[in-house]
């Protein structure tokens, strides 16, 4: 099942970095080639093309976004998951987080909410009416929060759930990691990096490295020759 | 420090229940998912079961689907395996296990026995 | 499903260098480039020791790295030591749904 939704990737830098985060020095260059993601949001897309962005929680997704199964009815079947475009005005839902903000989930259609000026956090949080759910969790879904409200009081350490890298202590940048978005540790020197070169060949990201560290560029392995090209073994390197 | 104590496990006959716990402290426990990892005795390591941050997301290994539940309580810093309809084949050491980078903090593991 | 293969046994002498290997299918080791090593003493808890292929988490003796080719991950363990004869485990995962797979396991005795 893994073939067609893994592939490996850098996360790549805020562009620009955020200050006080993992993501290098303010204002130092960044190279980006055509197609290679960037982090826009809280979601990864191609500068010239949106790639569905993988999820596990409806928090992970943006605030106009909501986390299920690409396919309908494919969901609680171990479908990959991703973030899709909330519900507009009197679309069908089976949950608030479906619905756009200044809405929430009445009797399965997206009614206007009286409280559209509170965060969407805080109107969930205050209406409890469970109309199923259509993750693969099976449980009733819990009103959806911000994480930064909730988490991101301090730094993230390595393995902490995050949003972008400024949520990471110093080091860490903010990349997919199978079940979420963590904080990782920025690439030293020797360690293996991905290097993206054919434009969509990103798929769904469900494991990213993050970038190499200052001074350093992810290049191929000097003595790592093998036979087929995609398989050459990228490092970080001295510039 | 990062620690992770186990209890709830002991001797159940099958077809029983048992309640795990595992108490979490040294570190910001509602920032990780986390999971269940059982070895039976002299068996090697099985992945039992994994829970996101905010306990809404949750999967489990073919063999415990419908009979165990796993969930946490983030304000008592605690996670939770519910195991309903034990089976000899279920006697194992239980760990919990903290999913940061991998697999990458666990408990000292719990005994559960089922036999008649 | 996807499998990990561990050999069930290997051994050296202290000094000497060892390597387990861990074969998998295309879609788990090979496929995505991702695995992980847990050293586990007997009668205590696993330790991660490797992830990523071959990233040391702070606090783990250089002496251990690992590395991949093909469908093959390989943990070696260099300047062999007594407190190094243990279990290890190679791990990867499956994303859907989400699942730990580990490899059978792997004796490492220090001989003499």
């Known amino acids: 099942t893994l073939n067609s939704v893994l592939i490996n990737s850098n996360a790549i830098k805020n562009l620009p970095p955020p200050l006080g985060g993992a993501g290098g020095q303010p204002g130092s260059a960044v190279s980006v080639a055509p197609g290679v993601l960037y982090e826009g949001g809280n979601k990864y897309q191609t500068l010239d093309n949106y790639q569905p962005y993988p999820c596990a929680e409806d928090e992970e997704c943006g605030t106009d976004e909501y986390c299920s199964s690409p396919s309908r009815g494919a969901a609680g079947v171990g479908g990959v998951q991703i973030c899709l475009a909330c519900r507009k005005r009197r679309k069908r839902c089976m949950r608030h987080a479906m619905c756009c903000p200044g809405n929430y989930c009445k009797n399965g259609i997206c009614m206007p909410s009286d409280h559209s000026h509170l965060p969407r956090g805080e109107i969930e949080e205050g209406i409890i009416e469970n109309l199923g759910n259509d993750h693969g969790a099976g449980d009733g879904y819990p009103r959806r929060t911000t994480l930064t409200s909730k988490i991101y009081h301090t730094k993230g350490q390595e393995g902490s759930v995050c949003l972008r890298s400024s949520d990471c202590a110093t080091g860490l940048c903010c990349a997919r990691h199978f079940w979420s978005k963590i904080c990782k540790p920025v690439l030293k020197e020797g360690q293996v990096c991905t290097k993206h070169r054919r434009k969509g060949s990103h798929g769904l990201e469900i494991f990213q490295r993050c970038y190499c560290g200052e001074g350093l560029a992810c290049r191929i392995q000097k003595d790592h020759h093998q036979t087929s090209n995609s398989s050459r073994l990228h490092t970080c390197q001295r510039h | 420090q990062v620690q992770l104590v186990e209890s709830g496990g002991g001797l159940v006959q099958p077809g029983g229940s048992l309640r795990l716990s595992c108490a979490a402290s040294g570190f910001t426990f509602s920032s990780y998912w986390m999971s269940w990892v059982r070895q039976a005795p002299g068996k090697g390591l099985e992945w039992v079961s994994g829970i996101s941050y905010s306990g809404s997301n949750t999967h489990y290994a073919d063999s415990v689907k419908g009979r165990f539940t796993i969930s946490r309580d983030n304000s008592k810093n605690t996670l939770y395996l519910q195991m309903n309809s034990l089976r000899a084949e279920d006697t194992a050491v239980y760990y919990c296990a903290r999913m940061g980078i991998d697999l990458d903090y666990w408990g000292q593991g719990t005994l559960v026995t089922v036999s008649s | 499903d996807i499998a990990l293969t561990q050999p069930a046994s290997v051994s050296g002498s202290p000094g000497q260098s060892i390597t387990i290997s861990c074969t998998g299918t295309s879609s788990d080791v090979g496929g995505f480039n991702y695995v992980s090593w847990y050293q586990q003493h007997p009668g205590k808890a696993p330790k991660l020791m490797i992830h990523?292929?071959?990233n040391r988490p702070s606090g783990v003796s250089n002496r251990f790295s690992g590395s991949k080719s093909g469908n093959t991950a390989s943990l070696t363990i260099s300047g062999l030591q007594a407190e190094d004869e243990a279990d290890y485990y190679c791990?990867?995962?499956?994303?859907?749904?989400?699942?730990?797979?580990f490899g059978g396991g792997t004796k490492l005795t220090v001989l003499g």
């Open positions: 791990q990867s995962w499956d994303v859907s749904p989400i699942t730990a797979v």
């Open positions: 990523d292929g071959s």
